[in-house]
């Protein structure tokens, strides 16, 4: 039950994290106008991964995309690569985690599958999230570089009475969104790797018995396998003796080779 | 089509007040922003400030802000501009306007002339 | 505040030249997020208020001639009346929409030779 929890919360929370993730990459409010000397701006210019835009004090609102692909920074080139790279892997992360479900019976896929599936979903949301911090992180760092050059020359000067006002630019939405999704979408990949552990026993996973026989003791070591004493039947090495009591999760686990905790 | 209708002109004693207002027709009346830009004779314009009549959020001319108050009335369409402490450099010509793209003025209203005099 | 300086003060053409009007601005009118230069441009004939001719310093408004043309970027810009008609004859104010508070420039009289 609580493997199935684990799975199914892992799920979740990645799904909330992608969905947040894809959210942030098409959100416009990367970077906002610095407003600290100035609360209330007659434009407020706010730019995003793919465009640019203004809101006017009359209410309107105008934007321009960047169609340019060689003109733009490279910083801003490798942050929508990592963001892309980011959803691409979620997205394959969530497909996969979809037949790897405990609670989705699809044939007669065996619990190995699942494990292993599970597995896989649960690394590719790992670095789906991190993906998304570096990015975020990345864009954050390109903006308090910014930041502080321009605060350095907030006013470059032509000549006379003439000067022109660089527009500062401070954290948008999108990076704390961004930061939320990726650490939500690391947080369900963990998860979904611990939840892989317990869905099939390993067969080191036994409890020793011994059997007391009259005039030969057999031991059985865990595992389950008997001891080479040259006595019984057991030779193909079949498991004979659960020793542990078994979870609900458990119940129809074996003949399963590994063990994912 | 749009419209802005003002009051009529007004003749003030100083250190009175005045309400000028402003009818607005012919669109989304709460879409929009409200300007009051004033004109003293033979001069040019002064922006005094704006009103936007969903939320009667106001913008002030920090000039204006112990002069002029901006007040809206949703059910009739009309923003109001309250001048008070009057003084003979208040006489001048106020315009409303309606905000466009660009923070331009696109529509006006015809004016109104406010003398202060003793 | 941003100053608005128009010039000349006054403007005498003959009808069906070219007029040029032109207004310099303290600090750049230009929006980094949208690349629009918050400049507009009215027309005040005597007796009534403005009338929007150019917005975005370039954009003229619906039902204006295309005789008026605006151009310019960051702080400086010109409007060009191609071929003035008697009833151009008006004052013509540039106007700050780029930050609060808005501001007008001081205003340039054209009048027919």
């Known amino acids: 039950m609580a493997v199935t929890a684990c799975q199914g919360l892992g799920f979740v929370v990645s799904l909330i994290g992608i969905a947040g993730i894809i959210a942030a990459t098409c959100m416009d409010q990367w970077s906002t106008q610095d407003l600290y000397n100035n609360p209330v701006t007659a434009v407020f210019n706010y730019q995003g991964l793919w465009r640019s835009c203004v809101r006017e004090s009359s209410g309107f609102t105008e934007c321009r995309g960047y169609f340019t692909l060689l003109g733009l920074p490279a910083m801003l080139q490798a942050v929508r690569a990592l963001m892309i790279v980011g959803i691409v892997l979620g997205a394959i992360g969530l497909l996969v985690s979809i037949f790897a479900l405990k609670c989705i019976r699809i044939g007669s896929m065996e619990d190995s599958a699942k494990a292993n599936m599970t597995l896989t979903s649960g690394i590719m949301f790992i670095v789906s999230g991190l993906c998304a911090i570096a990015g975020v992180s990345v864009f954050a760092n390109m903006l308090v570089t910014n930041f502080w050059m321009s605060t350095a020359n907030m006013y470059t000067g032509m000549g006379g009475m003439v000067q022109t006002v660089q527009t500062r630019y401070t954290f948008g939405a999108a990076l704390f969104v961004g930061w939320v999704a990726g650490g939500l979408t690391l947080i369900g990949g963990v998860m979904m790797c611990i939840a892989c552990r317990g869905l099939a026993p390993e067969e080191t996973n036994y409890k020793a018995v011994s059997y007391h026989a009259s005039g030969h003791s057999v031991a059985y070591k865990p595992g389950g396998f008997k001891a080479s004493t040259g006595f019984g039947s057991n030779t193909k090495n079949k498991k004979i003796y659960d020793g542990g009591a078994r979870t609900e999760d458990e119940v129809q686990s074996y003949p399963s080779k590994h063990d994912y905790v | 089509q749009v419209q802005l209708v003002q009051s009529g002109a007004e003749v003030k004693k100083p250190g009175a007040s005045v309400k000028v207002s402003c009818k607005a027709s012919?669109?989304?009346?709460?879409?929009?922003?409200v300007n009051w830009v004033r004109q003293a004779p033979g001069q040019g314009l002064e922006w005094i400030g704006m009103?936007?009549?969903?939320?009667?959020?106001?913008r002030l001319n920090q000039q204006f802000k112990d002069k002029a108050t901006l007040t809206v009335d949703t059910s009739t369409s009309t923003v109001y501009m309250e001048l008070s402490s009057l003084r003979s450099e208040d006489t001048a010509v106020y315009y409303c306007?309606?905000?466009?793209?660009?923070?331009?003025?696109?529509?006006w209203g015809q004016g109104t002339l406010v003398t202060v005099s003793s | 505040d941003i100053v608005m300086t128009q010039s000349p003060d006054s403007l005498a053409v003959s009808l069906g030249e070219r007029a040029t009007i032109n207004c310099l601005s303290s600090?750049?009118?230009?929006?980094?997020?949208?690349?629009?230069?918050?400049l507009t441009w009215y027309q005040q004939k005597p007796g009534q208020p403005p009338k929007l001719l150019i917005y975005?310093?370039?954009t003229r408004d619906s039902g204006v001639p295309d005789r008026f043309t605006g151009s310019g970027s960051g702080v400086d810009f010109t409007l060009t009346i191609s071929s003035v008609q008697a009833e151009d004859v008006a004052v013509y104010y540039c106007?700050?929409?780029?930050?609060?508070?808005?501001?007008f420039g001081q205003g340039t009289k054209l009048e027919i030779k």
């Open positions: 012919g669109y989304t009346f709460t879409n929009y922003w």
């Open positions: 306007a309606r905000v466009w793209s660009g923070n331009a003025f696109d529509y």
């Open positions: 975005w310093a370039s």
């Open positions: 106007q700050n929409g780029f930050s609060f508070p808005f501001t």
């Open positions: 009103v936007h009549p969903s939320g009667s959020e106001t």
């Open positions: 600090q750049s009118l230009l929006a980094s997020g949208n690349q629009r230069n918050y």
